[in-house]
């Protein structure tokens, strides 16, 4: 029976992934019962990605390593809609590392997953970035202009946002 074997395969995958993420929240995508998309619990989902707000305070490098161990990266923001979704889950009195850095201090910003940096899709606070020694980007809230990006020193511990593709089983 096709449906039975599909269910057995799915349960097997879920069991296999439990060693990395003890719980997955899955939804059926579309009308086809074959397509289940999952995010680890309690990650949130938007379009084809899962997001995790890490409240532990770590340097940028340690934050990225923490994400990568889970099969994710520090968040790469591709659209205004994506940023609008992300900020719903952030606290206004906190700052969160993005997957954006300028390792050489030459204002060659690069996303951790090699997505090309597009100046037209950036959400820097006004006047930012403003310091060649501040080589990592955070998102934070400023009462004058709401949520935006700021450059800061990479070693200063911050909260962070991890992003991964949805898990399809």
């Amino acid at each position: 029976n096709f449906m039975y074997s599909k269910t057995v395969k799915r349960l097997s995958k879920l069991r296999e992934y439990q060693q990395y993420h003890p719980s997955l929240t899955c939804v059926m995508e579309g009308k086809d019962i074959e397509d289940w998309s999952c995010c680890p619990t309690p990650w949130t989902s938007f379009q084809s990605s899962c997001y995790f707000i890490s409240t532990g305070m770590q340097s940028w490098t340690k934050s990225q390593k923490n994400c990568s161990v889970m099969g994710a990266d520090l968040v790469v923001i591709n659209t205004r809609e994506e940023q609008d979704f992300i900020i719903q889950n952030l606290k206004r009195n906190s700052s969160y590392f993005l997957g954006l850095s300028d390792p050489g201090g030459r204002r060659h910003w690069q996303w951790v997953d090699q997505t090309p940096y597009n100046e037209n899709v950036t959400f820097w606070h006004s006047g930012e970035p403003n310091n060649l020694d501040e080589r990592c980007a955070i998102i934070n809230f400023r009462s004058s202009e709401e949520w935006g990006w700021n450059d800061i020193h990479c070693h200063v511990p911050q909260k962070s946002i991890c992003k991964m593709k949805k898990i399809y089983i």
Epitope: E16, Y17, Q19, Y20, T61, Q64, K65, S68, V69, M70, G71, D73, V112, D113, Q114, M164, K165, I167, Y168
Partner: nanobody
Framework: QVQLQESGGGLVQPGDSLTLSCADS????????MGWFHQAPGKEREFVAA????????AYADSVKGRFTISRDNAKNTVYLQMNNLKPEDTAVYYC????????????????????WGQGTQVTVSS
């Protein structure tokens, strides 16, 4: 826990071939996307090649396209880098790296995307 061990490096002449291997002693190798990077003295670690968990998707640095081939054998918990027509500029320490991935078709080219690294194997191309 992921533990990676490279082998197969050595001293070869320009135009020669070499195959590097990277073995993982972990139990769930097939859930890890793999990459090869190299580091020449005084330089940053650079991307060479990457492969998805299934082996179906690969990527290469422009400098090695058409000369190097990455492959994997999930039954043997091993990833390979076949290097043909080696050039003096390929001289470097070669590292393999692993990263958990839930997508059979995703590969990763950024060194910071890989939390697990081997110790490296030296490749020297000289006449």
């Amino acid at each position: 826990q992921v533990q990676l061990q490279e082998s197969g490096g050595g001293l070869v002449q320009p135009g020669d071939s070499l195959t590097l291997s990277c073995a993982d002693s972990g139990r769930t190798f097939s859930n890890y996307a793999m990459g090869w990077f190299h580091q020449a003295p005084g330089k940053e670690r650079e991307f060479v090649a990457a492969i998805s968990t299934s082996g179906g998707s690969t990527a290469y640095a422009d400098s090695v396209k058409g000369r190097f081939t990455i492959s994997r054998d999930n039954a043997k918990n091993t990833v390979y880098l076949q290097m043909n027509n080696l050039k003096p500029e390929d001289t470097a320490v070669y590292y393999c790296a692993a990263r958990l991935s839930f997508s059979g078709s995703s590969y990763y080219q950024g060194p910071l995307q890989y939390p697990y690294w081997g110790q490296g194997t030296q490749v020297t191309v000289s006449s």
